[in-house]
């Protein structure tokens, strides 16, 4: 009996530009002889339905139809036909099919590959054209994929140390598509500093599919109106 097992759940998520390994494990009742077996990997794009050959391994020969694509002969010996794709790009997302032939048997499995890009976030203060005691803080998120993103603003005061979401005077602009396929978006918070307590901490909170934990950038309102801090580092998807 010949069986192929792909990633549990049928979906693999990988960061943009990563060297991704798309899993495919072979289960066979006898020890594998790689000189008498074949592995073919196919890819079907999200945008069109045509299947394309990515990599082929037959006994004493292997061929990559996508530059750098490889199945390890040393791992194949122990039943691992996983495909390594260095420098994965957004357009390479889609359905991957692993087809294994141990004559006369054939088995296959498919997996969906999602490619994500983590946003970079930065805070800017825009005082141009603003009234006295009025400030506009901009939270720019750039280079993310997919397009869906959630940006919120929170504040913490000495009186209320738990973060409170701000819903008034927040405007989030449209997402803009970059040349490389990633997206940018800016969210603005308008503040009247005369009505706010010095020492209040404001945070721009970015949530995205590529992030394990939200990306937070903060500033503290001081007597001198504002003090922008560096974006706090968080674990990106890996």
């Amino acid at each position: 009996d010949l069986k192929v097992e792909m990633m549990a759940g049928g979906t693999q998520i990988t960061p943009l530009n990563d060297n991704v390994t798309i899993f495919c494990n072979i289960f066979y009742s006898q020890p594998l002889n790689i000189t008498s077996m074949g592995i073919t990997w196919f890819w079907k794009s999200l945008t069109f339905d045509k299947e394309v050959k990515v990599f082929e391994f037959f006994g004493d020969h292997q061929e990559a139809f996508r530059p750098g694509a490889i199945v390890s002969p040393w791992r194949l010996k122990s039943g691992d036909a996983s495909l390594r794709l260095p420098g994965i790009q957004l357009e390479e997302a889609g359905e991957y099919r692993c087809e294994v032939v141990v004559t006369p048997l054939k088995a296959q499995g498919t997996v969906q590959l999602e490619v994500v890009a983590s946003p970079a976030s930065r805070l800017l203060l825009d005082q141009v054209g603003m009234k006295e005691n009025e400030d506009k803080y901009m939270c720019e998120s750039s280079g993310f994929y997919p397009e869906a993103i959630n940006i919120t603003w929170e504040k913490q005061t000495q009186k209320f140390p738990h973060p409170i979401e701000i819903s008034e005077d927040v405007i989030t602009g449209p997402t803009i598509k970059n040349m490389d396929g990633t997206f940018n978006v800016t969210s603005c918070l308008k503040l009247n500093s005369s009505q706010e307590d010095p020492g209040t901490v404001y945070q721009c909170v970015v949530r995205h599919a590529s992030l394990h934990t939200p990306l937070r950038s903060n500033f503290t309102l001081t007597a001198a109106r504002h003090s922008l801090s560096e974006t706090e580092k968080t674990d990106n998807f890996s």
């Epitope: 004493d60 002969p73 691992d80």
Partner: antibody
Framework: EVQLVQSGAEVKKPGASVKVSCKAS????????MDWVRQAPGQGLEWIGD????????LYNQKFRGRVTLTVDTSISTAYMELSRLRSDDTAVYYC?????????????WGQGTTVTVSS | DIVLTQSPDSLAVSLGERATINCKAS??????????MNWYQQKPGQPPKLLIY???TLHSGIPDRFSGSGSGTDFTLTISSLQAEDVAVYYC?????????FGQGTKLEIK
């Protein structure tokens, strides 16, 4: 920085078993296989086998088959080599080594070695 | 099993001179256009250190006085200008077939 840190020296009696650990850091554990190689005093190098942390698949040198067991714990990036039914000629330094498997096959980083002495 | 035979067993070379170590395989270690022969250096009390892989590719951080050549069954490790720190035992290893096998080693000394 890639590091492989092995467990300490062991003294065992003939017939006993020994389990050597190899803690990996500084790289993605599942991207490389782990080789195990031994070296008897004053002798050359002998390949014991390797393990693929991706699926736990193992390849053993026929000479050790039935006596050696290679395992991994991916949650702590650690590989293990257990050798049973020890004999005096198993006295050696045992090495783990990170093994590239996609673009060639070679051991590019090695542990410091674990001395196993089998003596009655 | 593929048997690797190194020659010579030991070698004494003057500082600054060329050192050459040979490795002969009992069968070809070539596969799909590549040669699966690696070279390691081992100093006393230390683990082996990778010098050359795929017959001729220099591992990162290894000085370029080390070079490898050959294909099929005959391979050579060359040190173009011997330095004092090159005193060690050198091993060839094939990774085409299991079990992966090593040569018996060549001890390199200074004359």
């Amino acid at each position: 920085e890639v590091q492989l840190v092995q467990s300490g020296a062991e003294v065992k009696k003939p017939g006993a078993s020994v389990k050597v650990s190899c803690k990996a850091s500084g790289y993605t554990f599942t991207d490389y296989n782990m080789d195990w190689v031994r070296q008897a005093p004053g002798q050359g190098l002998e390949w014991i086998g390797d393990i693929n942390p991706n699926n736990g698949g193992t390849l053993y040198n026929q000479k050790f088959r039935g006596r050696v067991t290679l395992t991994v714990d991916t949650s702590i990036s650690t590989a293990y080599m257990e050798l049973s039914r020890l004999r005096s000629d198993d006295t050696a330094v045992y090495y783990c080594a990170r093994s590239e498997v996609f673009y060639g096959n070679y051991a590019d980083y090695w542990g410091q070695g674990t001395t196993v002495t089998v003596s009655s | 099993d593929i048997v690797l035979t190194q020659s010579p067993d030991s070698l004494a070379v003057s500082l600054g001179e060329r050192a050459t170590i040979n490795c002969k395989a009992s069968q070809s270690v070539d596969y799909d256009g590549d040669s699966y022969m690696n070279w390691y250096q081992q100093k006393p009390g230390q683990p082996p250190k990778l010098l050359i892989y795929a017959a001729s590719t220099l591992h990162s951080g290894i000085p370029d006085r080390f070079s490898g050549s050959g294909s099929g069954t005959d391979f050579t490790l060359t040190i173009s200008s011997l330095q004092a720190e090159d005193v060690a035992v050198y091993y060839c290893q094939q990774s085409k077939e299991d079990p992966r096998t090593f040569g018996q080693g060549t001890k390199l000394e200074i004359k």
